[in-house]
């Protein structure tokens, strides 16, 4: 049987054979991949990149969250959507997951001017069906998925909006485990609205296999702030394996080449 994909840290600390990022298959060796380093001064301002409109993000829900063996994932099940933000159509929220390390300087997938952050949160959305502008795009959409990426850094205060998620981690240490979070809204996880005005935009891929090149990325400039103990909880409570021998951390794909693509900013 073909080895399953994994992160470098898993291959280093496990006896199970697995495919590290440089050996990922599917579309992962193509040339419009994510994540990337964003050179903030090279990104051109595009006036079309206006504010986002969040629908259902403010509704308190009891979300299901699971350890999927690669990350912790909240199942959003179309209960929220986004529009605006220079996107061509409304997009339905599918899932939210995060990437992290056990150190402050290397947990994010994207970097800004060469600088990585402690974590990165991805809210993954799919374009509402029947909203593509032309036949070619409908058949081969480069923006079928919209990911909102939020960089996370350490602050001095506990971020209360993240507590339901952080507290749920203890219930899902092993892969395939799931639990229900205490009631919360997606808005609780986001920075204040005025901090969502500044963002970067480029076309790329999923950062995990099969690395499909159909993602319109939005990377927000202003990081979310979590307390150090909230950040460390992810690497302390979660494991890649059912034996709980390999702590879940460094679930970060290495940076990919920008190539001929351009990054624009709001």
């Amino acid at each position: 049987a073909e080895s399953h994909w994994c992160y470098e840290v898993q291959a280093e600390s496990s006896n199970y054979p697995c495919l590290v990022p440089v050996k990922w298959g599917g579309n992962c060796q193509k040339d419009r991949q994510s994540p990337i380093n964003i050179v903030t001064t090279k990104a051109k301002v595009d006036k079309k990149l206006g504010r986002f409109f969040f629908s259902g993000y403010d509704k308190k829900q009891t979300w299901t969250v699971q350890n999927n063996g690669h990350s912790v994932m909240m199942l959003l099940e179309n209960k929220a959507s986004i529009s605006g933000g220079g996107l061509p159509a409304p997009y339905q929220a599918k899932q939210l997951h995060l990437h992290w390390s056990d150190l402050p300087y290397k947990g994010s997938e994207h970097s800004l001017d060469g600088e990585h952050f402690a974590m990165e949160m991805h809210i993954v959305h799919e374009k509402e069906k029947g909203t593509s502008r032309n036949v070619k795009e409908a058949q081969d959409p480069e923006d079928e998925i919209a990911v909102l990426a939020f960089l996370v850094e350490a602050g001095t205060q506990v971020n209360e909006g993240f507590q339901p998620l952080v507290e749920a981690l203890s219930n899902i240490p092993k892969p395939e485990m799931s639990t229900t979070m205490a009631e919360s809204s997606l808005l609780d996880l986001l920075p204040k609205e005025e901090k969502l005005r500044h963002y970067f935009r480029y076309l790329g891929s999923l950062t995990t296999p099969t690395c499909d090149e159909k993602v319109v990325w939005t990377v927000f400039r202003e990081p979310i702030q979590l307390h150090r103990e909230q950040i460390l909880a992810f690497s302390q409570k979660l494991y890649y394996d059912k034996e709980q021998t390999v702590s879940m951390k460094d679930n970060v794909r290495p940076l990919q080449q920008l190539g001929q693509r351009t990054v624009i900013k709001s």
Epitope: L103, P104, Y105, R228, E229, L232
Partner: antibody
């Protein structure tokens, strides 16, 4: 009371290796990162690297990644730094410090270990 | 990496005087600057965090200000025990970097 107690002064020969220690007390050792800093005589402070004692994860200043190896022993609440292929440039005082915030200030420091490399 | 410039290299003051130390970052770092005191043959001691936040146990004569690229540590009435080297450290970007220090001397 939070305390970091470092091992004593060392005189070593060029080309050899040495390992210094930093014993922590007065707080939960695995909840805070331990940083290592170099200070040459009459000079300023230079960051070497950091270890997460809970996980063993490390990160190094590029300048020191082939020079220093950081480890930690949870059972004794002790962090270690090994320095290899020693030269006179490595003669310095080495401090361990606790990172008070994640990726920020250093709120408690050890008393320093003086390393002299001489033949 | 972010460069930190401290000035002056040496400050000479008389006891009771007010003194200010300057620290400049090569790019904007918000308020992510921290100040340390290092007495002769001692280890650094945290005086001020995040540009202006006080530390418990540190005398109230020490204060800090500034944001962006320019920061100041002040001692409003110098005492003989304040004779030391003062360092600033930026924690905005990895790797963290320190200034070269300012030495405080008594006239």
């Amino acid at each position: 009371d939070v305390q970091l107690v470092e091992s004593g002064a060392e005189l070593v020969r060029p080309g050899t290796s040495m390992k210094m220690s930093c014993k922590a007390s007065g707080y939960a050792f695995t909840n805070y990162l331990i940083e290592w800093i170099k200070q040459r005589p009459g000079q300023g402070l230079e960051w070497i690297g950091v270890i997460n004692p809970g996980s063993g994860g490390t990160h190094y200043n590029e300048k020191f990644k082939d020079k220093a190896t950081l480890t930690a022993d949870k059972s004794s609440s002790t962090a270690y730094m090994q320095l290899s292929s020693l030269t006179s440039d490595d003669s310095a005082v080495y401090f361990c410090a606790r990172e008070g915030d994640y990726g920020a200030r250093f709120d408690y420091w050890g008393q320093g270990t003086t390393l002299t490399v001489s033949s | 990496q972010i460069q930190i410039t401290q000035s002056p290299a040496i400050l000479s003051v008389s006891p009771g005087e007010r003194v200010s130390f300057s620290c400049r970052a090569s790019q904007s770092i918000g308020t992510r600057i921290h100040w340390y005191q290092q007495r002769t043959n001692g280890s650094p001691r945290l005086l001020i965090k995040y540009a202006s936040e006080s530390i418990s146990g540190i005398p109230s004569r020490f204060s800090g200000s500034g944001s962006g690229t320019d920061f100041t540590l002040s001692i409003n009435s110098v005492e003989s025990e304040d004779i030391a080297v003062y360092y600033c450290q930026q924690s905005n970007s990895w790797p963290t970097t320190f200034g070269a220090g300012t030495k405080l001397e008594l006239k």
